[in-house]
Interface confidence: low
């Protein structure tokens, strides 16, 4: 008995093939003997079957002695054995017909559990593998379940249903709703003016939901909200911001806000926290903010940084065009009777050099300038 | 899309020099190190020295240090290589590459095609 | 300078079945709780690609038949099932100390 695998909501055509190359009668009928359809003549039948409106075949084959059926918006309880009856002959077609669902909205958030559920045929005993969209297999029976779904899920799920050595494919489309980036980190000098993007990683029709960001200053004991807002149908409108910083905030998407200006007592990390209406759980990014400020006190030029570096962080002061008078990997460097000329201060990790801030040492009878 | 376009293949003399170019695409040319790479013909991998379009600032390879002189210009985005006093040697490909931007920072995620510098008299 | 010294120099895999290659460093290229080791394919004529960050990270577009392992200084590159197109050179690299340092390669031919 030949097995045919068919897709739930798809279109399945099988087979049947007599020996004479010509339109003679056939029949095809359900596992129940009821008739499903045949020919007369050159004209199509339907018998009373429940497929009757979905049941169709192929006329222009049937002069090649072929004749097909086939069975359009496929059903679970579709799946049977259909016997095609054509020059006293008997052919056997067992339909096994599966279906494959996510549990819930294909729409997550970044760490919640997506589980697939399949509709299988009384009888059947298949075997699912799943591959997502970074690679990653799963297998199962009748149920598959990811917990901590992750960006990378995003995108086309394609999963095989494997059945009596017949395979059939599923492919289903998973939305990961979050940021871009986890966590980003942005490195600016003393007064410079701060922008951090949010960018989300999805895009959808309308968008609404209001969000929070957080902040821990590095020199501050406690976090404190800077800034609460709504967004509506991809609108932003700031509800609350604090007075010191006073930030601003885009009217559109992507999420965007600036600080007027890094300052010391700025430096250190937020949690931007977005509820969209309709989810539970919400959207996070860390944010970090490193602060620079390279100065000149008497004999004394230093440089600092303020806010969350990485031990890995190599901070440097060095004549401009020279080699490196001082390598660290510490928070604050300084070189006693610096000589005159154009110093840089950089922050670098593994040779990228992250923040730069350049202060000219006067001969000693003057100031410095910091340009 | 990060791309790194290198100029065409070179023949020199012995004793000459030659500069190379790579061009950077994609990305913002100052925020990135450019390295170079020598790769002798059916040979192994060999790091010469990088580059921080953003200050000028270089760093070498001590072993190749007198061999390679690193530039880049901003306004163009593109870095440059010059091997002086060439000798059979200096025969190789030379590829410029970049290191990625995330848990990948350290690696060498994107290459240039590569030069082909042959030295014959 | 650090060495990472690749075995086997090359090696013969069938088709749909594992290539295991090795790289041992001469000092341990861990800080932090990361190694910082890389893996590269090169195919004739072409720059080398990034395979694996960070000993055991896969790049972004590369197959999942790619694995790496280790830490300290003991590191593989595991390639299952093996595919004709995975017929190359594979380069280890170390990226903790300057300068960073490449080993001396592995050939890989699929039978």
């Known amino acids: 008995k030949k097995v045919v695998l068919g897709k739930k909501g798809d279109t399945v055509e099988l087979t049947c093939t007599a020996s004479q190359k010509k339109s003679i009668q056939f029949h095809w009928k359900n596992s129940n003997q009821i008739k499903i359809l045949g020919n007369q003549g050159s004209f199509l039948t339907k018998g009373p079957s429940k497929l009757n409106d979905r049941a169709d075949s192929r006329r222009s084959l049937w002069d090649q002695g072929n004749f097909p059926l086939i069975i359009k918006n496929l059903k679970i309880e579709d799946s049977d054995t259909y016997i095609c009856e054509v020059e006293d002959q008997k052919e056997e077609v067992q339909l096994l017909v599966f279906g494959l669902t996510a549990n819930s909205d294909t729409h997550l958030l970044q760490g919640q559990s997506l589980t697939l559920t399949l509709e299988s045929p009384p009888g059947s005993s298949p075997s699912v593998q799943c591959r997502s969209p970074r690679g990653k297999n799963i297998q199962g029976g009748k149920t598959l379940s990811v917990s901590q779904l992750e960006l990378q899920d995003s995108g086309t799920w394609t999963c095989t249903v494997l059945q009596n050595q017949k395979k059939v494919e599923f492919k289903i489309d998973i939305v990961v709703l979050a940021f871009q980036k986890a966590s980003s980190i942005v490195y600016k000098k003393e007064g410079e003016q701060v922008e951090f993007s949010f960018p989300l990683a999805f895009t959808v029709e309308k968008l609404t939901g209001s969000g929070e960001l957080w902040w821990q200053a590095e020199r501050a004991s406690s976090s404190k909200s800077w800034i609460t807002f709504d967004l509506k149908n991809k609108e932003v409108s700031v509800k609350r911001v604090t007075q010191d910083p006073k930030l601003q905030m885009g009217k559109k998407l992507p999420l965007h806000l600036t600080l007027p200006q890094a300052l010391p007592q700025y430096a250190g990390s937020g949690n931007l926290t977005l509820a969209l209406e309709a989810k539970t759980g919400k959207l996070h990014q860390e944010v970090n903010l490193v602060v620079m400020r390279a100065t000149q006190l008497q004999k004394n030029l230093t440089c600092e940084v303020w806010g969350p570096t990485s031990p890995k962080l190599m901070l440097s002061l060095k004549l401009e065009n020279k080699e490196a008078k001082v390598s660290k990997r510490e928070k604050a460097v300084w070189v006693l009777n610096p000589e005159a000329g154009m110093w840089q201060c950089l922050l670098s990790d593994s040779g990228q050099v992250l923040l730069e801030s350049n202060i000219k040492v006067l001969p000693t009878w003057s100031t410095p300038v910091q340009p | 899309d990060i791309q790194l376009q290198q100029s065409g293949p070179e023949l020199v003399k012995p004793g000459a020099s030659v500069k190379m170019s790579c061009k950077a695409s994609?990305?913002?040319?100052?925020?990135?190190?450019i390295n170079w790479v020598k790769q002798r013909t059916g040979q192994g991998l060999e790091w010469i020295g990088e580059?921080?379009?953003?200050?000028?600032?270089?760093y070498y390879n001590e072993n190749l240090k007198d061999k390679a002189t690193l530039t880049a210009d901003k306004s163009s985005n593109t870095a440059y290589m010059q091997l002086s006093s060439l000798t059979s040697e200096d025969s190789a490909v030379y590829f410029c590459?970049?290191?990625?931007?995330?848990?990948?920072?350290?690696?060498?995620?994107?290459w240039g095609q590569g030069t082909l510098v042959t030295v014959s008299a | 300078d650090i060495v990472l010294t690749q075995s086997p120099a090359s090696l013969a895999v069938s088709l749909g079945q594992r290539a295991t290659i090795s790289c041992k460093a001469s000092?341990?290229?861990?800080?932090?709780?990361?190694?910082?080791m890389n893996w590269y394919q090169q195919k004739s004529g072409q720059p080398p690609k990034l395979l694996i960050y960070?000993?055991?990270n896969l790049e972004s577009g590369i197959p999942a038949r790619f694995s790496g392992s280790g830490s300290g200084t003991d590191f593989t590159l595991n390639i299952h099932p093996v595919e004709e197109e995975d017929a190359a050179t594979y380069y280890c690299q170390q990226s903790i100390q300057d300068p960073c340092t490449f080993g001396g390669g592995t050939e890989l031919e699929i039978k």
């Open positions: 580059i921080y379009p953003g200050s000028g600032s270089d």
């Open positions: 590459a970049r290191k990625g931007e995330n848990g990948n920072s350290l690696a060498f995620a994107y």
């Open positions: 000092q341990s290229v861990d800080y932090d709780g990361d190694s910082y």
């Open positions: 994609g990305y913002t040319f100052t925020d990135y190190v």
């Open positions: 960070a000993a055991s």
